[in-house]
């Protein structure tokens, strides 16, 4: 059965300066390959977080993604600004050169409220 990417919330609202959690769970880790979060779609989409590397200043993983059986790829965005508004997608790739996108979550729209 094909892996499914589940983003349970269609939208979340967060006050500027606060943090928010974007939830994402997978039904399987197979086929092997990375999981990444993007804002937007198409050529102009922006990489927000990759579980293959560190150094995403305001974004952290919520659960321990180093567990070999981990299926929770939720992220927390801290100190949210109005520029963070948009629709965020959790995307599963199959390994390759380059990696191939095989499944995306339905997206979670982030609304940023003025403080």
């Amino acid at each position: 059965t094909e892996v499914k990417v589940i983003q349970p919330e269609k939208s979340v609202s967060v006050a500027a300066g606060d943090s928010t959690v974007l939830n994402c769970t997978l039904t399987s880790l197979l086929p092997v390959g990375p999981i990444r979060w993007y804002r937007g779609v198409g050529q102009s989409r922006q990489l927000i977080y990759s579980f293959t590397t560190e150094h995403f200043p305001r974004v952290t993983n919520v659960s321990d993604a180093t567990k070999r059986s981990n299926l929770d790829f939720s992220i927390r965005i801290s100190n949210v600004t109005p520029e963070d508004a948009g629709t965020y997608y959790c995307v599963k790739f199959q390994r390759g050169s380059p990696d191939t996108e095989i499944q995306s979550g339905g997206g979670t729209e982030v609304y940023v409220l003025a403080k």
Partner: antibody
């Protein structure tokens, strides 16, 4: 620079126990899963056990399950391997290794030699 | 189990390919580890099929397809003489495995 330094090896008799340690530096230890790998004299590499970054999940090769225990102390940036009921077949150089995101290894320690002999 | 040739040899400057088979492309990632002498610390030359750590020379590269992985050394040097172990992580079983090692001799 990433550094992994094992200690605790030595000569023990069959049936005895030993605890190996691995001191990590040069990276955020609490963000990485870790593993122990050994190499018997004249043999290849054998993965023994792995542990998640937070320490809650552990994994073992069948041949050491119930006899070896992997653990970590993130406050001390240290990894451990407790080995019980040692036999001559456990004689090897024991390495600690840092795991990549997909549970391969990117950095290795210099190793510590364990000799089990009567 | 991962299978690799026991030995390969090459002249300096030649291209060397070492293959590793036995994994499942659907569930297994590969890496290559260099060991210059028995009991010395292994060095990772490739992980995640084709990713080279920053301190490893660009003559080392890797690829994977089907049930096999390949380590390629382009323009091999005398200092590349070592035993090369392929390693795999199986996302289905959560287990790491190694091949028996390939001894590279540079003539």
């Amino acid at each position: 620079d990433v550094q992994l330094v094992e200690s605790g090896g030595g000569v023990v008799r069959p049936g005895e126990s030993l605890r190996l340690s691995c001191a990590a530096s040069g990276f955020t230890f609490s963000s990485h899963a870790m593993s122990w790998v050994r190499q018997a004299p004249g043999k290849g590499l054998e993965w023994l056990a792995g542990i998640s970054a937070g320490g809650s999940d552990t994994y073992y090769i069948d041949s050491v399950k119930g006899r070896f225990t992997i653990s970590r102390d993130n406050s001390k940036s240290s990894l451990y391997l407790r080995m019980n009921s040692l036999t001559a077949e456990d004689t090897a150089v024991y390495y600690c290794a840092r795991e990549t995101w997909n549970h391969l290894f990117d950095y290795w320690g210099l190793g510590t030699l364990v000799t089990v002999s009567s | 189990a991962l299978t690799q040739p026991a030995s390969v040899s090459a002249n300096p400057g030649e291209t060397v390919k070492i293959t590793c088979s036995g994994g499942d492309y659907y569930s297994t990632y590969y890496a290559w580890y260099q060991q210059k002498s028995p009991g010395s610390a292994p060095v990772t030359v490739i992980h995640s099929d084709d990713e080279r750590p920053s301190d490893i020379p660009s003559r080392f590269s890797g690829s994977a397809s089907g049930s096999a992985a390949t380590l390629i050394i382009t323009g091999v040097r005398v200092e590349d003489e070592a035993v090369y172990f392929c390693g795999g992580y199986d996302g289905r079983t959560y287990i790491n495995t190694f091949g028996a090692g390939t001894t590279l001799t540079v003539l």
